[in-house]
Structure formats: C-alpha cells, structure tokens
C-alpha cells in the first residue's frame, strides 16, 4: 500500500523525509487530544482510545527523519495541512496548533525555534 509520494528532491531534503514517514498517528493523537468525547475522526473511533499508542507510533515516525530536529517544522506543517479541512472552527484550529507545537516536547525532541503553522490558501 506504500507509494512513492510524488515530490522529488534528494533524500536528505526535509520535504522528501516528511513524505516518507507516516504522520497519521500524529494527526490522530492530536485530534484525540482536542476532540475528546466527540463522535468520530476519519473512520477510526477515538472516543475511548488511549492516546499513548498513537503517540508512541507518532514519535517513532518523527524519529525516523534523518534530520529530525531540522525537519520538525516541515513535519508539523504537513500535519496541519493534512488536517486543516477537518477543523470545524477557529477555536479548533487554535487548539490544534497549540497541541501541534507541544508534540516535539512530548516526543522528547526540541521544539523548532520558529515554525509558521499557517496553511496558505486555507482557514488555517
């Protein structure tokens, strides 16, 4: 089911590295933290699941990037972009961004110093 995901560039580029990892556990982990008891996310029921399994897989995936520290911001931006359309209102967008910026710390990585999570052309 894996596919080469479009973008070109040498293997050390952040863009390519972010494309090679599975960010879905990170997305679900954050969605669970901000949605708590809400109905459903994707087709995966998150009402009663622990966040720790998503977090473990998420951190493992981020750690797979050759330059985890250097590429962290691009990874966070990609997560934001992937989930932007699912965030129902401005408050949810802000919550998601806040949780997203906490993600590196949860994975014991340093947070990127500057990281603009505004997705161009969208509400986010």
């Amino acid at each position: 089911m894996r596919r080469e995901r479009g973008r070109q560039g040498d293997s050390s580029s952040c863009e390519r590295q972010v494309d090679r990892v599975n960010l879905k556990p990170c997305e679900q982990h954050i969605m669970q933290r901000i949605m708590g008891e809400q109905e459903q996310y994707d087709s995966y029921d998150i009402r009663s699941t622990r966040s720790s399994d998503q977090q473990q897989r998420c951190c493992d995936e981020l750690n797979e990037m050759e330059n985890t520290q250097r590429c962290m911001c691009e990874a966070l931006q990609q997560i934001m972009e992937n989930q932007c359309d699912r965030l129902q209102d401005r408050q949810m967008v802000q919550q998601f961004k806040r949780e997203l910026m906490n993600l590196p710390q949860q994975c014991n990585f340093r947070a990127p110093q500057r990281c603009d999570l505004d997705v161009s052309g969208g509400r986010c």
Epitope: N22, K24, P25, Q28, S43, T49, R50, N63, E64
Partner: antibody
C-alpha cells in the same frame, strides 16, 4: 516481494544462535521489520521490531536482554541474535515486513518469511 | 502492556455458516492499530484485516472486521472449507505489540 529466514537449528541450553532474514523484490530500507515466533502447537508471539533507520528497536519482555535486533539496509538483511537460550525459546521464528496504509495510517505485516526452526535441547 | 484475549479458542461451523471470533484488549486500542491474521497449518500467517475493519488486498468480502475500544470482532459469513485455519488478532500501536491466543476454526 519475499523474505527468507536462515540460521535456525539445534542448540544447547545457554547457547547462542544468529538468525537472519534476507529480503528481495522491494526497497528494504522503506520498511520496519519485525520478528514473531511460534512454539510447536502454540500461538504467535511477537518478539521485536526495528524501524527503517534502526533508530527505534522494541523487544518483548520475554526476550529483553537476551535477544538483539539489527539490520543492514545495504544488504537488505535483518538479523536476530539469540543468547542465553532455554527450552522455552524452541519455536519457528518468522520475520515479517511491516507496512502502513499511506492514506489512513494503519500498520500491518504484509510479507512474511516461511520461518526457521530453532530447537533448544541438551 | 496490552493483553489481547481471543474467544472462543476453537469453533466448529458447517460450510455456509457464520463464524464470529472475539478479541478483547485489556486496555483501549485505537482501531488504527488492530489487525487480524489467518494462519493455515505449516504456513506463515497471512494478513486478513487491518485498521480493525479494512480487508487486505485479495481477501474475500465474507471476512468482516468490526469493533472499537477494547472489543473487536472478526466475522466469517458463508464459511468455506478453505477458511479452516487459526485466526489471530494483534494490537500494533503500543510496544510490546501483542497477539491474541488464536482461534482455531474447523468445519463441522
């Protein structure tokens, strides 16, 4: 897309063995690899996993400190070093490729080797 | 450590019948990390269902996965002789990635 284990055999209690799994037909460095064992007539037991870059390695409690996972992406090989073996380690050892669905995220073992039998007996 | 408990350990069903296998997790598991495998004697396991409910490529529609949280189910509707095998659930979200004890399915 194939996996083939090797290195199994008869070993005395307290002894060591090195199992290796050779991959072919796919880009080995793109996949996490796992080892699973099955004692004769018993169920599956997950033993350990190693991520694509070897940065993250996990072990089952039953083998922690005795078994060591490693991989060589250039050789498309993942190995499992078995030390301090006991009769309880007698099993068929399978290596399995872990993939994920890029659209929805789930992980699964989609390619398995035929297995190699390890017998620990004096 | 998440313990996976499968019931029943063995089930006998006539060809054409329906088999239901249950998998209970000791703590909640995200659907994303729940997988079912089929193993026939002398063979390695074969991927059947991932993400709790998505059939793997080539798996017939008579196999259906469902459930969430701590309770998951594999249903075989319209059992065929070729479905005789042992079925295992696995959670692969939190290390150690644990398997259920297996359910042997035989033809009545």
């Amino acid at each position: 897309q194939q996996l083939k284990e090797s290195g199994g055999g008869l070993v005395k209690p307290g002894g060591s063995l090195k199992l290796c799994c050779k991959a072919s037909g796919f880009t080995f460095s793109d996949y996490n690899m796992n080892w699973v064992r099955q004692a004769p007539g018993k169920g599956l037991e997950w033993i350990g996993s190693i991520t694509r870059s070897s940065r993250t390695i996990y072990y089952a409690d039953s083998v922690k400190g005795r078994f060591t996972l490693s991989r060589d992406n250039a050789q498309s090989t993942v190995c499992l070093q078995l030390n301090s073996l006991t009769a309880a380690d007698t099993a068929t050892y399978f290596c399995a490729r872990e993939d994920f669905n890029v659209y929805t995220g789930p992980y699964y073992y989609d390619v398995w080797g035929p297995g190699t039998l390890v017998t620990v007996s004096s | 450590y998440v313990m996976m408990t499968q019931t029943p350990s063995s089930v006998s069903e006539a060809v054409g019948g329906t088999v239901t296998i249950y998998c209970r997790a000791s703590q909640s598991v995200s659907n994303m990390f729940l997988v079912w495998y089929q193993q026939k004697p002398g063979q390695p396991p074969k991927l059947l269902i991932y993400g709790a409910s998505t059939r793997a490529t080539g798996v017939p529609s008579r196999f259906r996965g469902s459930g969430s949280g701590t309770q998951f189910t594999l249903t075989i509707s319209g059992m065929k002789a070729e479905d005789v095998a042992t079925y295992y659930c696995q959670q692969n979200g939190n290390s150690p990635y644990t398997f259920g004890g297996g359910t042997e399915v035989v033809v009545k």
